[in-house]
C-alpha cells in the first residue's frame, strides 16, 4: 500500500496491462477492455446532482502517479484506487466516497486516511 507522503516515480512496465473500462473507454478499447503502460483504476465521484458515479479504465504511465494519489479536491467528493498486479485488477477495486464533513480534509494536513491501494508490482 502506498502511503501519501511517498513520491515514488512510476516505473516502466515491460508489458502491456489490460483493464476493465466503464464510462471511460478510449477508442482503442475492445469489449470494454483497454490497454495501458501504466495503471488500471476505478473511481467514484459525485455528479452535479450528487449521485455517486463509478468509472473505471486505464491510466497511462505519464502522470498516473499523481492521478492515483487521490489528493482531496475542495468541494468535490471523489476517491480513486489504482492497481497493476494483474490484468483487469480494477474489477476488484471498490473505492468509497469520503465522508461529507471531514475536518482532516478541510483544515489539517493530509493524513493516511485514503481508502485507495496503489500497488507497485513491476
Amino acid at each position: 500500500k502506498k502511503e501519501d507522503g511517498e513520491s515514488t516515480a512510476p516505473t516502466a512496465r515491460p508489458k502491456v496491462l489490460r483493464c476493465k473500462c466503464h464510462h471511460h473507454c478510449p477508442e482503442d478499447s475492445v469489449n470494454n477492455i483497454c490497454s495501458t503502460d501504466g495503471y488500471c483504476f476505478t473511481m467514484i465521484e459525485e455528479d452535479d446532482s450528487g449521485t455517486p458515479v463509478v468509472t473505471s479504465g486505464c491510466l497511462g504511465l505519464e502522470g498516473s502517479d499523481f492521478q492515483c494519489r487521490d489528493t482531496p479536491i475542495p468541494h468535490q467528493r471523489r476517491s480513486i484506487e489504482c492497481c497493476t498486479e494483474r490484468n483487469e485488477c480494477n474489477k476488484d477495486l471498490h473505492p468509497t466516497l469520503p465522508p461529507l464533513k471531514d475536518r482532516d480534509f478541510v483544515d489539517g494536513p493530509i493524513h493516511h486516511k485514503h481508502h485507495h491501494h496503489h500497488h507497485h508490482h513491476h
Epitope: P14, K15, V16, R18, P26, E27, D28, S29, V30, I33, C34, S35, T36, D37, G38, C58, G60, L61, E62, R86, N87, E88
Partner: antibody, heavy 116, light 112 residues
C-alpha cells in the same frame, strides 16, 4: 539470450486436435505475454491471440475463438496452443512470440500439415 | 479490424541503392497512452520474422543504422539507405495499437 523453442513439423488428420508447444528461456517468463501467429503460404501473417503467463489472462482474435486455446505452464516456462477440429485450412506455420508492447522475439515456427 | 496496406508488393533494387517501403493503416495507430505501436519486421526465406524497428522509429538492438522508420497517424515508411545482400527478404509492418493486432501483406525486396 532470449529463445523461444518450437518443435518440428506435425502431421495430423482432419477432425483431430493438436497441441503445439513453445519453450521460453533467457528471460523471466511471467514478465512478457506470449503471442501466437499463423502464416500460410501467400497469405501473410495472422494474429491468433496472446496469453499473459503471470495470470493466464488471454485475448483472442475473434476468427480463432473456438479454434485455438492458449495455456501456459509457468513451472517449465512453456506456452501451449491447442487447435481443434482441424481442417486443411489449418495447415500453416505457427509461430509463438514474446510480446511486451510489440513482438521482439519469435520462435522458429512449427509447420502443421492437416491431411488424410 | 485495422487493415495494413503495404506498397510496393515487390521492390527490385540494386545493391547500394536506397529502398523505401510504405505502410498505411485504415485507422490511426496513435494509442490512448500517446504511443504509436507500429513496427517493422524482416523475414528471410525459411526463417521466422525478425524485429527491425519498433514504435515507428526505434531501431531494435543489433539492427544496422542504414534502417530507419518514420511516419505518424496512418502513414509510415521504412527506409534502407544502402541495400546490402543480407537485407533481401520480405518486410512486414505490424500494428499493436488495436486488437486484433494486424500485419501488412509484405514487401519482397529483391535484387534488380
Amino acid at each position: 539470450q532470449v529463445q523461444l523453442q518450437q518443435p518440428g513439423p506435425e502431421f495430423v488428420k482432419p477432425g483431430a486436435s493438436v497441441k503445439l508447444s513453445c519453450k521460453a528461456s533467457g528471460y523471466t517468463f511471467t514478465s512478457y505475454w506470449v503471442q501466437w501467429v499463423k502464416q500460410r503460404p501467400g497469405q501473410g501473417l495472422e494474429w491468433i491471440g496472446e496469453i499473459d503467463p503471470s495470470d493466464n489472462y488471454t485475448l483472442y482474435n475473434q476468427n480463432f475463438k473456438g479454434k485455438a486455446t492458449l495455456t501456459v505452464d509457468t513451472s517449465s516456462s512453456t506456452a501451449y496452443m491447442q487447435l481443434s477440429s482441424l481442417t486443411s485450412e489449418d495447415s500453416a506455420v505457427y509461430y509463438c512470440a514474446r510480446f511486451g508492447f510489440y513482438v521482439d522475439y519469435w520462435g522458429q515456427g512449427t509447420t502443421l500439415t492437416v491431411s488424410s | 479490424d485495422v487493415v495494413m496496406t503495404q506498397t510496393p508488393l515487390s521492390l527490385p533494387v540494386s545493391l547500394g541503392e536506397q529502398a523505401s517501403i510504405s505502410c498505411r493503416s485504415s485507422q490511426s495507430l496513435v494509442h490512448s497512452t500517446g504511443n504509436t505501436y507500429l513496427h517493422w519486421y524482416l523475414q528471410k526465406p525459411g526463417q521466422s520474422p525478425k524485429l527491425l524497428i519498433y514504435k515507428v522509429s526505434n531501431r531494435f538492438s543489433g539492427v544496422p543504422d542504414r534502417f530507419s522508420g518514420s511516419g505518424s497517424g496512418t502513414d509510415f515508411t521504412l527506409k534502407i539507405s544502402r541495400v546490402e545482400a543480407e537485407d533481401l527478404g520480405v518486410y512486414f509492418c505490424s500494428q499493436s495499437t488495436h486488437v486484433p493486432f494486424t500485419f501488412g501483406s509484405g514487401t519482397k525486396l529483391e535484387i534488380k
